[in-house]
Amino acid sequence: ESALITQQDLAPQQRAAPQQKRSSPSEGLCPPGHHISEDGRDCISCKYGQDYSTHWNDLLFCLRCTRCDSGEVELSPCTTTRNTVCQCEEGTFREEDSPEMCRKCRTGCPRGMVKVGDCTPWSDIECVHKESGTKHSGEVPAVEETVTSSPGTPASPCSLSG
């Protein structure tokens, strides 16, 4: 809970101008939902729905709220202490290796495979070979005989976009 964000934790493009060192570290920090003033004396609230900070910090600026992309639904709005939570729309998912976009779930499994897992906002449908039970990985063949299924219902948030 007492995690702390400093200027150094931010990516170069998020860093603000260098700050003067404050004498007492325990007095030089602002709570979640705030950032520090340029002179280091005051804490200033983030703007509700526009920016946020999640931890005690010495940031000169709050972090900009994520805007959900088209193809995403907003699970919870941005507050001064929490970023927006976005989730892929029903029938689409976000892979760990391509978190920047939601991809369409497959509508069915290739021939010789059975579906064992539904489409969720964070995973495609899961297919296994009928005989061996081994998972199918890789792209679906261009020509396939599919076992159609309806997409799963989103159940919980995937990782934040943005």
């Epitope: 809970e1 007492s2 325990s26 007095e27 920090l29 939902g33 005051d42 804490c43 609230s45 005690w56």
Partner: antibody, heavy 118, light 107 residues
């Protein structure tokens, strides 16, 4: 149920110090900032500062810097506000108040009357 | 420091009346404004935060509005138990400051 229970009334002489306690229960003590607000008899409310027990972070209003010290004891879920070099103008009811994230102040202690009189 | 000026400083109204209290800040507080109710011998009680969000358990006759520097607390239909002093408070920048209070009485 969230409760903030403060110590009893105090009578002090000018120049002395007073230490007021505020015992928290019903929530995770180290996850919330505690503020101190005072109210002179028949007057308005005045913010004094905060302490975050989870990290020991403090911030004091400029007016009280050098005279106020806020501390926390995580073992007893208690915060303390000590005010030194008391003068008659410090006669007031002192409140601890919990700061909910982005919300000031969602729960208050019952108040502690500190009377400074020679 | 940001100064908050409440008006009126006191008012008397009848049960069932619509009551409005205003709070003007000396600078823009970006909606970071709360309202409290304080009854005699009790600590303040949070009514409204972020200018217009009602705290859970607060009757819906209490509402807040405003932005920038001008804010309003409205009691749509005054009840006898609403007799109290009402304070606005900015939580935009430290030091957090309060208005001087508005004393509300029943006619």
């Amino acid at each position: 149920e969230v409760q903030l229970v403060q110590s009893g009334a105090e009578v002090k002489k000018p120049g002395a110090s007073v230490k007021v306690s505020c015992k928290a229960s019903g929530y995770t003590f180290t996850s919330y900032t505690m503020h101190w607000v005072r109210q002179a008899p028949g007057q308005g409310l005045e913010w004094m500062g905060w302490i975050y027990p989870g990290g020991g972070y403090t911030k004091y209003a400029q007016k009280f810097k050098g005279r106020v010290t806020m501390t926390g004891d995580t073992s007893t879920s208690t915060v303390y506000m000590e005010l030194s070099s008391l003068r008659s103008e410090d006669t007031a009811v002192y409140y601890c108040a919990r700061h909910e994230e982005g919300i000031y102040f969602d729960k208050w202690g019952q108040g502690t009357l500190v009377t400074v009189s020679s | 420091d940001i100064q908050l000026t409440q008006s009126p400083s006191s008012l008397s109204a009848s049960v069932g009346d619509r009551v409005t209290i205003t709070c003007r800040a000396s600078q823009d507080v970006s909606g970071a404004l709360a309202w409290y109710q304080q009854k005699p011998g009790q600590p303040p009680k949070l009514l409204i935060y972020w200018a217009s969000t009602r705290e859970s358990g607060v009757p819906d006759r209490f509402s807040g509005s405003g932005s920038g520097t001008d804010f309003t607390l409205t009691i749509s239909s005054l009840q006898a138990e609403d007799v109290a002093v009402y304070y606005c408070q900015q939580h935009y920048i430290t030091p957090f400051t309060f208005g001087q209070g508005t004393k509300l009485e029943i006619k």
